[in-house]
Amino acid sequence: SGVFQLQLQEFINERGVLASGRPCEPGCRTFFRVCLKHFQAVVSPGPCTFGTVSTPVLGTNSFAVRDDSSGGGRNPLQLPFNFTWPGTFSLIIEAWHAPGDDLRPEALPPDALISKIAIQGSLAVGQNWLLDEQTSTLTRLRYSYRVICSDNYYGDNCSRLCKKRNDHFGHYVCQPDGNLSCLPGWTGEYCQQPICLSGCHEQNGYCSKPAECLCRPGWQGRLCNECIPHNGCRHGTCSTPWQCTCDEGWGGLFCDQDLNYCTHHSPCKNGATCSNSGQRSYTCTCRPGYTGVDCELELSECDSNPCRNGGSCKDQEDGYHCLCPPGYYGLHCEHSTLSCADSPCFNGGSCRERNQGANYACECPPNFTGSNCEKKVDRCTSNPCANGGQCLNRGPSRMCRCRPGFTGTYCELHVSDCARNPCAHGGTCHDLENGLMCTCPAGFSGRRCEVRTSIDACASSPCFNRATCYTDLSTDTFVCNCPYGFVGSRCEFPVGLPPSFPW
């Protein structure tokens, strides 16, 4: 669809005569009839197949035609067509004399014709005006013409329909050839597909408008490139949605079981060495001078009673010092200058000469010890506490502080590792000499039956249209990640496609 435009510019009829040679009275009041038709190999009379148009009287004898609406008629003259422009045409322009006001063909005498031109033309759409001039012995007509497409029609022959739009069916303007030119932020054949935020993950993200990045189930982040781990996952990560891959030192279904208490809590004090010994259990190896489960107690070096023969012990920054009683010397007062004659044995101990009286030895009664029977027996010296328990003197008695996993007066009893019910998902616990073992029910595995193995909701391939399936371990259900163009819990519904011509 388009318009053939004809611009009449100048008509010269100096003598003011008709085609017959007869003069007009008083002058030739000139109007024009235009006939546009298909190209003919020889221009011949016949229907004006592309249209006709007439002007009002534009002037008398010789005149220039203004480029506007002159006397109600339009200049340029418009000859609309609603077909593909063929590129060639035949054009007939007649100049007529109007003796009166009635310009209808039947109201005019046949000899009122002033002049007539008939040409064969070739014209491409959208060209600049093509100027032509036709001269006869009596008249001259100067005119120009061009073809332009109607609104929303484009291309070399005005045959391509394109209507700009910015709605659900497309977001585009039209190029001169009729091809679509997408508005910024849109793409696709009909510019219906938004261009998502730059970097938005192709599979895991989508958008409904430009520069947006909406995440599909199981994904998060500005660009939808971060997976969402299993709900409740504490110390774990994922590489695909709903996973919970534990960080180092953590275990269990939700990675909430501490397998590295030493690193996470640093329980051992005073430079002690920490060793993990199971979930939430550890052992501290104390540096010299410290004791306690966490090596939190500072040991006095005099606590071990290093001074013999009644020597008194004094703590010093770098150790201890023995103050020996008369008759004794040495680091620990172990050397005697006494003999049995000096009655060195206390608490009823009996003296025995040695080395020809140069030395002696005391035989102590029960409950006393020391080279002079000067010490009460320390009930802890015999290491009565089993399994690494710590012996503590409490006046006349003693007690054992047991390591985790042991109990009893002397820490001789092994606390059942199974008492804490460490086996998840109904696993059966077995105590072993150094630890425990879980026998897992069907569908679970791992040291503590914490890994779900059997029920895989994705095993039945429930997702359609090449969607990606993810198993939600907490609910035994699946989630489908739909490819572009599909929706629904199983990606079973295609997004409505546009008709072939959406305008």
Epitope: Q40, A41, V42, V43, S44, P45, G46, T88, S90, I92, K116, I117, A118, I119, Q120, G121, S122, D132, Q134, T135, S136, T137
Partner: antibody, heavy 118, light 107 residues
């Protein structure tokens, strides 16, 4: 008086060239499309080429396409036919004509003879 | 191309009688047809154009009719100067094509 006078015909060997001219007088040459039409000895009339009034459109019969070229010089009121790679079957009387039946125009020249022979 | 077929090839008619010549096109030529008279050594003379329009200066005994693909030239009362070859020409599309001619001779 309207006149169309052809010239440039003659005897020529196959493969050679000739240029025909048609001088117009007695009418406004630049207003009309022009035609070359030929008649071989003992045969009917055969259209050869066409050029529109301003020279913007040309048409040729298939057998001469690529060998013949029609042109015009409106300032000299002259029509031309450049004939290259001539063949024996191009032998004919060549007429130029101004045809515009819408305007009742039908002018023919007397013709010029072209003989292609070795 | 459009093929123009004339009939008859030769027509013998006595002076004063009517002569009817026929021209058929291989496709619709939308009345874009002319009839010519050709005498030896002369240029063709246009008689009828647009199927039925008489060219200026041509006697009224010549008339044309027809549309679509069938066209007729009628000479109502033959004069001695009318004996010649007549041919039709379609001006609808390129290539222009002529009929092969009808020779009108005195009976």
């Amino acid at each position: 008086e309207v006149q169309l006078v052809e010239s440039g015909g003659g005897v020529v060997q196959p493969g050679r060239s000739l240029r025909l001219s048609c001088a117009a007088s007695g009418f406004t040459f630049s207003n009309y499309g022009m035609y070359w039409i030929r008649q071989a000895p003992g045969k009917g009339l055969e259209w050869v080429a066409f050029i529109s009034h301003g020279g913007g459109i040309t048409y040729y019969r298939d057998s001469v396409k690529g060998r013949f070229t029609i042109s015009r010089d409106n300032s000299k009121s002259t029509l031309y036919l450049q004939m290259n790679s001539l063949r024996a079957e191009d032998t004919a009387v060549y007429h130029c004509a101004a045809l515009n039946w819408e305007l009742g125009i039908d002018y023919w020249g007397q013709g010029t003879m072209v003989t292609v022979s070795s | 191309e459009i093929v123009m077929t004339q009939s008859p090839a030769t027509l013998s008619v006595s002076p004063g009688e009517r002569a009817t010549l026929s021209c058929r096109a291989s496709e619709d030529i939308y009345s874009n047809l002319a009839w010519y008279q050709k005498k030896p050594g002369q240029s063709p003379r246009l008689l009828i154009y647009a199927a039925n329009r008489l060219q200026d200066g041509v006697p009224a005994r010549f008339s044309g009719s027809g549309s679509g693909t069938e066209y007729t030239l009628t000479i109502s009362s033959l004069q001695s100067e009318d004996f010649a070859v007549y041919f039709c020409l379609q001006g609808s599309k390129f290539p222009l094509t002529f009929g092969q001619g009808t020779k009108l001779e005195i009976k």
